[in-house]
């Protein structure tokens, strides 16, 4: 019998005796087969993850910041359920720390040198850590003590808490710099008081602060917000413009044997017996004799982090780095104004070869990080352990919604123009054998196909999407009797038709032979009945165009397209038969490295680009012999997407639309967590 | 058919210095770029070095300063002057030439460099 027994760490007496009780009533409700809690009590936080990493307990609740000492080394320690605030119709699960301004004062988050301050305290998350976090590396030398390189970076501050006997300068819009409601500027109002009242040129408060404070519209538009990209927005845009997202409060466990589902199961029914407004007896988010004890007294309730989600993700790149900052204390050396080196993601053995040429001959502007698959990248991406990659439309929606942006688009046309005009797109197709001349779009079912991955455009977002219209449910695997589609679960009979070996079975990467365009319509020609890919693939491998073996003596006259009406066209008529317009592959980057992997990029491209005419010895960028590694091989340029600049705007209404239609149909992991952080 | 053959490989203690070569045959050798990667036991494959055509050059950052890469047009061979070696250093090494185009996986049997005491 597996033990359903959940140790939950207990900081303090009272913590104890609540939790006491939560095991008590949880007995009383709960059937002797379901989960249970125990009681473990520590005497600190740090002791509490350091017991759960030793598996002596199994749970406790923290705040980011001792999230973050969690997910450190040796603890490993992983979030898995958060509490949230506000109604069930809409939780809040974290909060955005903001710079607010006033309209008319003109500077941007780089230029906050000289400037006048307000903080809600020292040492507190969205008020201190966050912003000083995050500007930490402009401080002036020697950073430590910390507070003397604050005061000497801002002209004058209020922070609360400070010491203002050894920094006069942190009281100086605060007299005395009490730490209490005492002083009119304490606290996240009062730090918004002391911008208002013109004490302070910048407060650093979080998104609510102003709503809480400003009832009305009219006198809220006088004010706006730093946005770390160095422009502003109006405080009501704060999910685009914030210095962090922060999570509020979060259960956190062991990555490996962390019993999440079990703390889940034990959660959930718990705030289902005991939560707002259910018992008089016991209730989990109040605190008779004390203050947030095991959770915090204002949660409405918990919702589970989706399991894709470790720590780093959890808080976010920004609060990371700000963290970072602040308990590492180590900058770049002198820093300039000239760009670090592009850190490139490359899927698997192939793409790590060709990127690592290129690593070669840019001499240092581009370095090479690998992932298996390309969530694992995006996950990369956003995290900062890589930069930028390339990314089919389909991926341009999820790293979109994991808050990463286009900044160039594949171009596959010949034009004077190139660079300065991103095209409308390609085209989606279906490809049949010209022999199984009963196919068509209408008798599909039962048929075998062939993906170039799940996910990507072409060759699921539109066919797939199409097909969901149809026939209303997700279960494609029984709409075909097999297939390949890179990315399924590996018992898929999706997965059937693969041709990779061992591990490496229908992997989305190029160790599987069927992944992306040319494994797909090789899939067709070995075993397929219908092959998903872009109008041009037939013909890049056909005709002698590819040398591989199988693909040598292929003629594209020997196939066929379906068209939507039920009737059938040769190849080269895709302009009239196709299933959909599909926007450009994008390379894609977090918004803070937007401007120098655009400029590295440009330059790469006129020294490695189309203009490369001999690349039997000379690294060309956009070639990898059919096998379209990290660009696709009929890549003329990188085109300026000029104000096409977020994942919406970039791959068009429609296209976001026909994705979020298939969303309920979606498996990746990646996706749910990137919604949980931003619905 | 591509061949590489490494050598100059051994044990050496730390501090140390090895001289590792890289002979190509059957490969467009003078106009490719060349590189030296090396696998630790249990490790991953990893970019050491490499040289363009040109002669430009490129390290990974722990090798910086103590590895140098050359190549010989004349004798279609390639070069890794390692020195100041370290136990950390300790893998196979391997040579590529990328005119293969990533995918054909020309790799020769490798060179094994050992830095102990």
């Known amino acids: 019998v597996p033990d359903k027994t959940v140790r939950w760490c207990a900081v303090s007496e009272h913590e104890a005796t609540k939790c006491q009780s939560f095991r008590d009533h949880m007995k009383s409700v709960i059937p002797s087969d379901g989960p249970s809690v125990a009681c473990v009590k520590k005497a600190s936080y740090l002791d509490c993850i350091r017991a759960i990493a030793a598996n002596e307990a199994d749970a406790v609740t923290l705040d980011a910041g001792l999230v973050y000492d969690a997910y450190l080394a040796p603890n490993n320690l992983k979030p898995v359920v958060a509490e949230f605030y506000g109604s069930k119709e809409d939780p809040q699960t974290f909060y955005y720390a903001v710079a607010v301004v006033k309209k008319d004062s003109g500077f941007q988050m780089n230029q906050l040198r000289g400037k006048k301050s307000c903080h809600t305290g020292l040492g507190r998350s969205a008020g201190w850590n966050i912003p000083i976090g995050l500007l930490y590396c402009d401080l002036p030398e020697p950073r430590k003590p910390l507070e003397k390189a604050v005061a000497n970076f801002f002209s004058g501050s209020c922070a609360p808490c400070a010491d203002g006997t050894d920094f006069p300068q942190l009281c100086q819009l605060c007299p005395g710099c009490g730490c209490s409601t005492l002083n009119q500027y304490f606290g996240y109002s009062g730090a918004f008081k002391c911008l208002k009242d013109g004490a302070g040129d910048v407060a650093f408060v979080k998104h609510s602060t102003i709503f809480e404070n400003l009832a009305n519209k009219a006198d809220r538009d006088q004010y706006e917000l730093l946005c770390l990209d160095n422009t502003r927005k109006p405080v009501d845009e704060y999910k685009d413009c914030h210095l962090a997202q922060v999570p509020s409060h979060t259960v956190v466990a062991r990555s490996m044997g962390g019993k999440e589902d079990l703390i889940w199961e034990l959660l959930n029914q718990a705030q289902e017996h005991f939560g707002k407004d259910k018992s008089k007896e016991f209730q989990l988010f109040s605190s008779p004799h004390g203050k947030d004890l095991l959770f915090k007294d204002s949660a409405h309730g918990f919702l589970k982090v989706p399991p894709r989600m470790d720590a780093k993700m959890y808080l976010g790149y920004e609060y990371v780095t700000a963290i970072r900052n602040l308990r590492e204390g180590t900058c770049p050396e002198a820093p300039t104004d000239e760009c670090k080196p592009v850190k490139w993601c490359a899927l698997s053995h192939h793409e790590r070869l060709k990127c690592d040429e290129w690593s070669v001959n840019s001499v240092g502007k581009i370095e090479c990080v690998s992932a298996e698959t390309t969530e694992d990248c995006i996950a990369k991406i956003m995290n900062g352990e890589a930069d930028a990659m390339s990314l089919d439309g389909g991926f341009v929606y999820i790293a979109g919604k994991c808050g990463l942006v286009p900044v160039l688009a594949e171009n596959y046309n010949k034009s004077d123009n190139c660079e300065d005009t991103p095209e409308a797109g390609y085209f989606a197709i279906a490809v049949v054998k010209k022999s199984a001349s009963d196919l068509t779009w209408d008798n599909l079912k039962g048929k075998k196909s062939c993906h170039t991955a799940v996910g990507r455009t072409a060759g699921w977002n539109i066919p797939m999407g199409l097909l969901y219209n149809k026939i209303n449910h997700c279960r494609f695997d029984e709409f075909f009797s097999e297939g390949c589609a890179p990315g399924s679960k590996k018992d898929s009979s999706l997965c059937k038709l693969c041709m990779g070996s061992g591990l490496n079975l229908c992997e989305p990467n190029n160790k599987e032979g069927y992944y992306g365009y040319t494994g797909a319509f090789r899939c067709l020609v070995e075993k397929g009945d219908v092959a998903f890919v872009k109008h041009q693939t037939v013909p890049q491998n056909t005709g002698g165009k590819n040398p591989d073996p199988w693909a040598k003596n292929l003629n594209e006259k020997d196939y066929e397209l379906l068209c939507l009406d039920g009737t059938r066209k040769p190849v080269e008529e895709y302009a009239n038969c196709h299933l959909a317009r599909a926007p450009n592959h994008a390379v894609v980057t977090r918004k803070d490295k937007e401007a120098c992997v655009h400029k590295i990029l440009r330059q790469q491209q006129h020294l490695f680009g189309s203009n490369v005419t001999d690349c039997s010895g000379n690294f060309c960028l956009f070639r990898s012999e059919t096998k379209d590694l990290l660009f696709r091989d009929d890549t003329v340029c990188l085109a300026k997407l000029h104000d096409r600049n977020t994942y919406e705007k970039y791959l068009g209404e429609e296209y976001v639309k026909a994705v979020g239609n298939l969303r309920k149909c979606s498996t990746s992991s990646l996706l749910e967590a990137c919604t949980f952080r931003r619905p | 058919e591509v061949q590489l053959v490494e050598s100059g490989g051994g044990l050496v203690q730390p501090g140390g210095s090895l001289r590792l070569s890289c002979a190509a045959s059957?490969?467009?050798?003078?106009?490719?770029?060349m590189a030296w990667y090396r696998q630790a036991p249990g490790k991953g494959l990893e970019l050491v070095a490499g040289?363009?055509?040109?002669?430009?050059?490129n390290y990974r950052d722990s090798v910086k300063g103590r590895f140098t890469i050359s190549r010989d047009n004349s004798k279609n061979t390639l070069y890794l002057q390692m020195n100041s070696l370290r136990a950390e250093d300790t893998a196979v090494y391997y040579c590529?030439?990328?005119?293969?185009?990533?995918?054909?996986?020309?790799w020769g049997q490798g060179t094994l460099v050992t830095v102990s005491s």
């Open positions: 059957g490969s467009i050798f003078s106009i490719a770029t």
């Open positions: 590529t030439d990328y005119s293969s185009r990533y995918y054909h996986d020309y």
């Open positions: 040289i363009t055509r040109s002669g430009s050059t």
